[in-house]
Amino acid sequence: HNTTVFQGVAGQSLQVSCPYDSMKHWGRRKAWCRQLGEKGPCQRVVSTHNLWLLSFLRRWNGSTAITDDTLGGTLTITLRNLQPHDAGLYQCQSLHGSEADTLRKVLVEVLADPLDHRDAGDLWFPGESESFEDAHVEHSISRSLLEGEIPFPPTS
């Protein structure tokens, strides 16, 4: 699998999408896992609803949500309030029994928040009548890794 890079800004939400063949993966639950080292296991972060018919419901684990459009064949993962420690290599998986097929390898990169370096006087804060409750703006910039690029930094 090629690795797709998704970039997000620290403190904001990042949306990762993983397309798949909806017929091939019909009836299968999906999962999002984090790769522990280059050759290490992929540690489950969150999986879709236990009832496949309800895969469209967003399922949360901490600040990570997963939802599956089983007809359209798109798995979507949202990382809310992205932090530097969220950077790393992940996988979208399709589950069958105790086995898991990789749908996409994803490298999450966290960019510094440019607002961090501004004076407080330049920042905009919502007024009393304004609410962010439903304003979950999700940003993602994605690209595929070039041949020869290494998703993990070399270990000394």
Epitope: N50, L51, L53, R58, W60, A65, D134
Partner: antibody
Framework: QVQLQQSGADLLRPGVSVKISCKGS????????MHWVKQSHAESLEWIGV????????GYNQKFKGKATMTVDKSSSTAYLELARLTSEDSAIYYC????????????WGQGTSVTVSS | DVVMTQTPLTLSVTIGQPASFSCKSS???????????LNWLLRRPGQSPKRLIY???KLDSGVPDRFTGSGSGTDFTLKISRVEAEDLGVYYC?????????FGGGTKLEIK
């Protein structure tokens, strides 16, 4: 604290429709799906279905397809259940219940809305 | 649909004594993910239903530890080690392993 506030009791004639509301507060409304459950003397508790408060997508118990319609208004953090062509068999208490996170299904419940159908 | 059967219909218990509620399902509730989606809720008179236990044995926040849930496959039990007056109401089990979700008929706890 988490609260699900449902609309008041209704006494209705057969053949009409009714729309019950459930307003969520004390949490981020779009983070949790909303379930609807019917409680009648004859059938105890029955799951009607669930709606994603984020996308509006729905999943229905086959038994209630054509009878119940679930909708959501994100701007007011309110979920709705509409019941069509009411008969006496629809007389019941209807509850909304919030889907929890991960395997915490239906963690908070509304106080219930009583619907009585009588001519 | 999975049928959930609860026994007894009514349970009369003296304050301070234990109580035991039984719930049986027509199919195994063990999911392919290794979890068993069996839950218990209490409907007190004039109040909203309150979740007590989820995935067989996890206690909801604020639920006293005199409540315990156990079981596997098709047989499940809710136990109260020492019944208190606030425990009266109707106890329901329900399953979330198979579509659609289904509930038991309930067991009414009365205080002797």
């Amino acid at each position: 604290q988490v609260q699900l506030q449902q609309s008041g009791a209704d006494l209705l004639r057969p053949g009409v429709s009714v729309k019950i509301s459930c307003k969520g507060s004390g949490y981020t409304f779009t983070d949790h799906a909303m379930h609807w459950v019917k409680q009648s003397h004859a059938e105890s508790l029955e799951w009607i279905g669930v709606i994603s408060t984020y996308s509006g997508d729905t999943g229905y118990n086959q038994k209630f397809k054509g009878k119940a319609t679930m909708t959501v208004d994100k701007s007011s953090s309110t979920a709705y259940l509409e019941l069509a062509r009411l008969t006496s068999e629809d007389s019941a208490i209807y509850y909304c219940a919030r889907e929890g996170h991960y395997d915490d299904a239906m963690d908070y419940w509304g106080q219930g809305t009583s619907v009585t159908v009588s001519s | 649909d999975v049928v959930m059967t609860q026994t007894p219909l009514t349970l009369s218990v003296t304050i301070g004594q234990p109580a035991s509620f039984s719930c049986k399902s027509s199919q195994s509730l063990l999911d392919s993910d290794g979890k068993t989606y069996l839950n218990w809720l209490l409907r007190r008179p004039g109040q909203s239903p309150k979740r007590l236990i989820y995935v067989v044995s996890k206690l909801d926040s604020g639920v006293p530890d005199r409540f315990t849930g156990s079981g596997s496959g098709t047989d499940f039990t809710l136990k109260i080690s020492r019944v208190e007056a606030e425990d009266l109401g109707v106890y329901y089990c329900w399953q979330g392993t198979h579509f659609p979700y289904t509930f038991g008929g309930g067991t009414k706890l009365e205080i002797k």
